[in-house]
C-alpha cells in the first residue's frame, strides 16, 4: 500500500514545488521525495522495505498523478542507496538516496531544493511546509494532485514527553505538529521546507496521525550532510 | 478581493472582558492561519499569537496567553479575540491579519483588518 | 524572544532620495523576515516576505536584502507616497517579534 498522506491540507499550487517527486513501485505512487541533486532524490528508507520484486520509478514535474502534464517525467532509478545505519525496525537514519537513470531535465517545474547543512534545530514555532500525495482523511481517500500543510515545529523536549514520543526523538530527528492536520505513512520521504530551504524528510514508521500527542517525526537532513555528500559526490 | 472586517471600538473598564471580532471574505477562511497584533500609539506592533480555523490550533506568544485568548466560528469566516483583566496597559490598537502562503514555504502577514481600538479607562 | 533593532529611529528626507533601513536580529533568523509600510492611524501593509521577495503590487523601488542577523530595506527614488513608518518582523521560532519602527519623514 502507499505509504503516505497529507491530512487536513489543501491543493498545491500547481508546480509551485519543483523540486517534489514521487517515488513510485510498478506504476503507483508510494512514497514522496525530494530533488536534491540533478540526478538524486532524497527520500525515505523504509518506502523500499516491500519493493524488492517491484520495478521502482522517480515522477518528476508533477501536479497530478494522473493527468497528462508538459513537465512530468518518469525516470528509472539506477541505484537505491539506503543510509547502512536504517534498520526496518527504527525511525532513525531514515534516509534513501536514488539516482536516476540520467540527469533529470531541469525547469519551472523541475529544479532542486537546497538542503540545510548547518547543523541547528529549527526554533520551535517555525512554520514549515511538508506536501505529499498520500490519502487525506481517515477514511482513505487519495489525491490525485499535490497536497501541502504548514505546521509548526514543536521542540523536542515537549515530542519526546512520555505521552507523546517518549524519548525516541533523538538530536537526528525533529517534530512538527500533529493536531488535525499532519503528515503521515506515505507522504514519508516527502519533503519539510522551511524558507525555501529541505530541513526534514518525512520518516515512514508507524504511527497514529492527526492527533496532537504523536507529533510528525521528521528527519534532520543537516545531521546527514557528510553522508549525503559522499553518496553525491 | 480578500478583506478582515473589525468590530467598532470599544471603551472598556479595569478589570472586564472584552471580545473583538475579525470577519474574513473572499478566500477560504480554514486554509490560512489569523494572527493577531496589538499596538500601542507611537510604538512597534507586538505579536500575540495565531490560530488556524481549519484545526483550532493556536500558538500564543508566552506574554499574552493569559490575557488572549483566540477562537474561531468557521461557520461565519470570523476569528475572536477575548482579553481579559483589563488594564490601562491594555489600551491600544489590535488588528487581525492573515498568514499569506507565497511559493512552497514562504509566509507573512499579507492582509490586514482596519484595526479595532480598545481603550480601558474608569 | 529575539529582539529586532531598527535604526535608525527616524529619518529626515527628501523625495527623490534613496534610503535604507537596517534591521539587525539577537540570533540569527535565516532569512524568515518580512518588511511592513504603515502610514498613520491605518494598517500595516506588506513590502517583503523572505528578507528578498516583494509580493505582486508592491513597486520595484523597495528592495529587501541581508541574511544571518543583519537586515535591509532600500527605497529607491523616493515617492511622496513612501513617507511613513516601517517595521520589520522576523518568523524564526516564536514569537514573531516586530523592530521599533523607522520613521521616514519629509524634509
Known amino acids: 500500500p502507499p505509504r503516505g498522506r497529507i491530512l487536513g491540507g489543501r491543493e498545491a499550487e500547481a508546480h509551485a514545488r519543483p523540486y517534489m517527486a514521487s517515488v513510485q513501485l510498478n506504476g503507483a505512487h508510494l512514497c514522496g521525495g525530494v530533488l536534491v541533486a540533478e540526478q538524486w532524490v532524497l527520500s525515505a528508507a523504509h518506502c523500499l522495505e516491500d519493493a524488492a520484486d517491484g520495478k521502482v520509478q522517480v515522477l518528476l514535474g508533477a501536479h497530478s498523478l494522473s493527468q497528462p502534464e508538459p513537465s512530468k517525467r518518469l525516470y528509472d532509478v539506477l541505484r537505491a542507496v539506503p543510509h547502512p545505519d536504517s534498520q526496518p525496525d527504527t525511525i532513525d537514519h531514515d534516509l534513501l538516496l536514488l539516482q536516476l537513470s540520467e540527469k533529470a531535465t531541469l525547469g519551472p517545474a523541475v529544479r532542486p531544493l537546497p538542503w540545510q547543512r548547518v547543523d541547528r534545530d529549527v526554533a520551535p514555532g517555525t512554520l514549515c511546509d511538508v506536501a505529499g500525495w498520500g490519502i487525506v482523511n481517515h477514511a482513505g481517500r487519495r489525491p490525485d494532485s499535490l497536497q501541502h500543510v504548514l505546521l509548526p515545529v514543536l521542540d523536542r523536549a515537549t515530542c519526546n514527553r512520555r505521552t507523546h514520543h517518549d524519548g525516541a526523538i533523538t538530536e537526528r530527528l525533529m517534530c512538527a505538529e500533529s493536531n488535525r492536520r499532519d503528515s503521515c505513512k506515505g507522504d514519508s520521504g516527502g519533503p519539510l521546507v522551511c524558507g525555501g530551504v529541505l530541513e526534514g524528510v518525512v520518516t515512514s514508521g508507524s504511527r497514529v496521525c492527526g492527533n496532537r500527542k504523536k507529533p510528525g517525526i521528521y528527519t534532520r537532513v543537516a545531521s546527514y550532510a557528510a553522508w549525503i555528500d559522499s553518496v553525491l559526490a | 478581493q480578500v478583506q478582515l472586517q473589525q468590530s467598532g471600538p470599544e471603551l472598556v473598564k479595569p478589570g472586564a472582558s472584552v471580545k473583538i471580532s475579525c470577519k474574513a471574505s473572499?478566500?477560504?477562511?480554514?486554509?490560512?492561519?489569523i494572527n493577531w497584533v496589538k499596538q500601542r500609539p507611537g510604538q512597534g506592533p507586538e505579536w500575540i499569537g495565531w490560530?488556524?480555523?481549519?484545526?483550532?490550533?493556536?500558538y500564543s506568544n508566552e506574554k499574552f496567553e493569559v490575557k488572549a485568548t483566540l477562537t474561531v466560528d468557521e461557520s461565519s469566516s470570523t476569528a475572536y479575540m477575548l482579553l481579559s483583566s483589563l488594564t490601562s496597559e491594555d489600551s491600544a490598537v489590535y488588528f487581525c491579519?492573515?498568514?499569506?502562503?507565497?511559493?512552497?514555504?514562504?509566509?507573512?502577514?499579507?492582509?490586514w483588518g482596519q484595526g479595532t481600538s480598545v481603550t480601558v479607562s474608569s | 524572544d529575539i529582539q529586532m533593532t531598527q535604526s535608525p529611529a527616524s529619518l529626515s528626507v527628501s523625495v527623490g532620495e534613496t534610503v535604507t533601513i537596517t534591521c539587525r536580529a539577537s540570533?540569527?533568523?535565516?532569512?524568515?523576515l518580512a518588511w511592513f509600510q504603515q502610514k498613520q492611524g491605518k494598517s500595516p501593509r506588506l513590502l517583503v516576505y523572505?528578507?528578498?521577495n516583494l509580493p505582486d503590487g508592491v513597486p520595484s523601488r523597495f528592495s529587501g536584502s541581508g541574511s544571518g542577523t543583519q537586515y535591509s530595506l532600500k527605497i529607491n527614488i523616493l515617492q511622496s507616497e513612501d513617507f511613513g513608518s516601517y517595521y520589520c518582523?522576523?518568523?524564526?521560532?516564536?514569537?514573531?517579534?516586530f523592530g521599533g519602527g523607522t520613521k521616514l519623514e519629509i524634509k
Open positions: 491579519a492573515r498568514l499569506g502562503y507565497f511559493g512552497s514555504s514562504y509566509h507573512a502577514l499579507d492582509y
Open positions: 473572499a478566500y477560504t477562511f480554514t486554509d490560512y492561519y
Open positions: 490560530i488556524f480555523p481549519g484545526s483550532n490550533s493556536t
Open positions: 540570533e540569527n533568523i535565516y532569512s524568515h
Open positions: 523572505s528578507a528578498t
Open positions: 518582523q522576523h518568523f524564526w521560532g516564536t514569537p514573531w517579534t
